[in-house]
Interface confidence: medium
């Protein structure tokens, strides 16, 4: 099942995705799609980027991490209730089925209207499992109680590859090196 | 010595099904990524279905998507290809393959040949 | 998905010359962070299934002669056999396992003239 993170209209969408490069610039190619991850590449791409830079994007969608060390995570500025659905980050490991692949749901929910000014205290206590985080423009929104879910399931599907599958010599040999623990 | 040995090969009618094994032995299945490959008479050689290490990944080449399920026992140390709604042009020699860390194909089963006709 | 293509598809060669077999991909299978080229080559005798000669375009697997030798880089590969034994007949392939799905060349046909 996947990972469910929430915004609202207007706001930017944050959909995390991470990995550890075996040293500074070993990048590892990543794409991010529509739609859940398909059996190769991802469908409806957005965003992709290659061992050296971002080399695909499309307008609203963007990386606000440094993806020079791992953080691959998904920007998606001033979300629309059709950016709801789920999203494909793949990391694109060179080998046979070698890549790590993670579905997200983003959820997107009706901006709320208010007859007045909102004074920040009320608009913590409207949403109290809302957490804003640094970006530019409107204020970039998650589920905090969705936070540890994507590392958790990210930890054990990656414990449970390198460890049954072998993947460690692998991960080593293409040069990425997903740390765990 | 890592062997594998196929079965389950054999004529069957278009819309039929057929379930193709591989027992390994010299090594555990699941220590491994798998693959099956095949190859039509006097044709090359096309990758069809894949299963990464874990077991947690299945991978499919888009001529069969839908139609074919890779599994293993790991009880049992073997390797499976379920194939339903066959279809004549999924005639050929099936290969199970074993996969070498992320990389190429090491080690090949003798081959088992599916024919599918009315 | 990569496309590999070999050329020729079939060729004559007599016993003891030098045989070569050429790979082309699609896309480049050189994965910059390691260096190594995610590319090998099998051998398919009549009735047999391949038999791996070749990895990472150039090392050879144990036990195979060593007459045969691999060499290229990025998309550009050649299969090299230096002196072309009566047992080298056989169809032979080049793979990639860069990126999925795994593709091989059509394969070509190696015989003695």
């Known amino acids: 099942s996947e990972v469910e993170y929430r915004a609202e209209v207007g706001q930017n969408a944050y959909l995390p995705c991470f990995y550890t490069p075996a040293a500074p610039g070993n990048l590892v190619p990543v794409c991010w799609g529509k739609g859940a991850c398909p059996v190769f590449e991802c469908g409806n791409v957005v965003l992709r980027t290659d061992e050296r830079d971002v080399n695909y994007w499309t307008s609203r969608y963007w990386l606000n991490g440094d993806f020079r060390k791992g953080d691959v995570s998904l920007t998606i500025e001033n979300v629309t209730l059709a950016d709801s659905g789920i999203y494909c980050c793949r990391i694109q490991i060179p080998g046979i089925m070698n890549d790590e692949k993670f579905n997200l749901k983003l959820v997107i929910k009706p901006a709320k209207v208010t007859p007045a000014p909102t004074r920040q205290r009320d608009f913590t206590a409207a949403f109290p499992r809302m957490l804003t985080t640094r970006g530019h423009g409107p204020a970039e929104t998650q589920t905090l109680g969705s936070l540890p879910d994507i590392n958790l399931t990210q930890i054990s599907t990656l414990a449970n590859e390198l460890r049954d599958s072998r993947l460690a010599n692998d991960l080593r040999d293409s040069g990425a090196t997903i740390r765990i623990g | 010595q890592m062997q594998l040995q196929q079965s389950g090969g054999g004529l069957v009618q278009p819309g039929g099904s057929l379930r193709l094994s591989c027992a390994a032995s010299g090594f555990t299945v699941s220590s491994y990524a798998m693959s099956w490959v095949r190859q039509a008479l006097g044709k090359g050689l096309e990758w069809v279905s894949g299963i990464s290490g874990s077991g947690g990944s299945t991978y499919y080449a888009d001529s069969v998507k839908g139609r074919f399920t890779i599994s293993r026992d790991n009880s049992k140390n073997t390797l499976y290809l379920q194939m339903n709604s066959l279809r004549a042009e999924d005639t050929a020699v099936y290969y199970c393959?074993?996969?070498?860390?992320?990389?190429?194909?090491?080690?090949w089963g003798q081959g088992t040949l599916v024919t599918v006709s009315s | 998905e990569i496309v590999m293509t070999q050329s020729p598809d079939s060729l004559a060669v007599s016993l003891g010359e030098r045989a070569t077999i050429n790979c082309k991909s699609s896309?480049?299978?050189?994965?910059?962070?390691?260096?190594?080229?995610?590319l090998a080559w099998y051998q398919q005798k009549p009735g047999q299934p391949p038999k791996l000669l070749i990895y990472?375009?150039?090392t050879r697997e144990s036990g195979v002669p060593d007459r045969f030798s691999g060499s290229g880089s990025g998309t550009d590969f050649t299969l090299t056999i230096s002196s072309l034994q009566a047992e080298d007949v056989a169809v032979y392939y080049c793979q990639q396992y860069y990126s999925g799905p795994i593709t091989f060349g059509q394969g070509t046909r190696l015989e003695i003239k």
């Open positions: 990472w375009a150039s």
């Open positions: 393959a074993k996969i070498v860390g992320a990389t190429h194909f090491d080690y």
């Open positions: 896309q480049s299978v050189l994965y910059s962070s390691n260096n190594k080229n995610y």
